[in-house]
Interface confidence: medium
């Protein structure tokens, strides 16, 4: 049997099962989430869930800069520190970098002081660099 | 190409909210991602950043403004607004509205700007 | 009261280069993009450099940006009467978390 590869949109790029989307737009974390979702298929801004798509995604980003953070779907909408994916995927891979998760700071980017391998928490009015992901 | 008119009283009392309105004509407002924001100047003064909104209705305020400022958008309209309760003599100045330029890395940088109202407090 | 610190005013003749200085701080001119802008009396502020040095489609060559640590510099050269104006610098500040213009500067051609 032949099995073909899922196509992703134009632009995005494809890893397991996924494809993802990286957008050069200034966006706070909200406006980030609402863009991915207008471009359908189930679109979020993206979870991620292992060292394996961490390291993909990284080396990709790495790609087309190396010193701006990226929004990613992991937030704390409660404000309590109870993280969680915008997506609904399950908070087990953590990768958080050892700043300090207080202050105002409930919406999750990818660093880029570690090449964008680890995590840091920032307010969710900065506008950044974002990332989506959906499943084809 | 992208044009901003501004509307709104040019005498506000003081104690009173002060609201003016931005329209867009030569592009959609909820189109290409642009944020959208308003700039005072006090009299022989420098310029002051009041705030933003996006197209989506999120806005982000100057600190030292936010408890008295609010911002809105109507898409069908093509158009923002700006309320600014509780105002002073101190608030008296030019207010313009102006687009960002909407680039890959740069934010707050305004390519588009509306002509600015001269609006005054005073009883 | 802004942070970013500019000379009240500068002057030089016709056909000169002025420079004007934007001084701030790691927070603000340090981390981010600069962008200035010129204003005439009456008249809406004009985007005439952003990103530190890149300049908007019908602005001259003549003018120029730069950024040396926390301070940045706007280069106007060959001077010309209608360069006569007051500019802005202007940042974010990542500690205010608020956007800031700077003081002013007002350029008198002589």
């Known amino acids: 049997d032949i099995i073909m590869r899922p196509s992703c949109a134009p632009g995005w790029f494809y890893h397991k099962s996924n494809c993802y989307g990286y957008f050069r737009k200034l966006r706070n974390w909200s406006d980030a989430e609402l863009e991915c979702q207008s471009y359908g298929n189930g679109a979020h801004l993206a979870s991620i869930l292992s060292l394996k798509e961490a390291s993909t995604i990284a080396e990709y980003i790495s790609g087309y800069q190396r010193s701006q953070p990226i929004w990613i779907g992991l937030h704390d909408p409660q404000k309590r520190q109870q993280w969680q994916w915008i997506d609904g995927a399950m908070y087990l891979y953590r990768s958080w970098s050892g700043k300090s998760m207080g202050g105002n700071k409930h919406c999750a980017e990818m660093s880029s002081n570690n090449n964008f391998l680890t995590w840091s928490s920032n307010e969710c009015n900065k506008r950044q660099h974002f990332l989506c992901k959906y499943r084809p | 190409q992208v044009q901003l008119q501004q509307s709104g009283p040019r005498l506000v009392k003081p104690s009173q909210t002060l609201s003016l309105t931005c329209t867009v004509s030569?592009?959609?407002?909820?189109?290409?991602?642009?944020?959208w924001s308003w700039i005072r100047q006090l009299p022989g003064k420098g310029l002051e950043w009041i705030g933003y909104?996006?197209?989506?209705?999120?806005?982000y305020y100057n600190p030292p403004l936010k408890s008295r400022v609010t911002m809105s958008v109507d898409t069908s309209k093509n158009q923002f607004s700006l309320n600014l309760s509780s105002v002073t003599a101190a608030d008296t100045a030019v207010y313009y509205c102006?687009?960002?330029?909407?680039?890959?890395?740069?934010?707050?940088?305004?390519?588009?700007w509306g002509r600015g109202t001269m609006v005054t407090v005073s009883s | 009261q802004s942070v970013l610190t500019q000379p009240p005013s500068v002057s030089a003749a016709p056909g000169q280069k002025v420079t004007i200085s934007c001084s701030g701080s790691?927070?603000?001119?340090?981390?981010?993009?600069v962008s200035w802008y010129q204003q005439h009396p009456g008249k809406a502020p004009k985007l005439m450099i952003y990103?530190?040095?890149k300049r908007p489609s019908g602005v001259p060559d003549r003018f120029s940006g730069s950024k040396s640590g926390n301070s940045a510099s706007l280069d106007i050269s060959g001077l010309q009467s209608e360069d006569e104006a007051d500019y802005y610098c202007?940042?974010?500040?990542?500690?205010?978390?608020?956007?800031?213009f700077g003081t002013g500067t007002k350029l008198t051609v002589l």
């Open positions: 990103d530190v040095s």
């Open positions: 202007a940042a974010w500040d990542d500690s205010l978390s608020e956007f800031l």
């Open positions: 790691t927070s603000n001119i340090g981390n981010n993009y």
């Open positions: 030569g592009g959609s407002i909820s189109r290409g991602g642009y944020y």
């Open positions: 102006a687009r960002e330029k909407g680039g890959d890395w740069e934010q707050l940088v305004f390519d588009h």
């Open positions: 909104i996006y197209h989506s209705g999120s806005t």
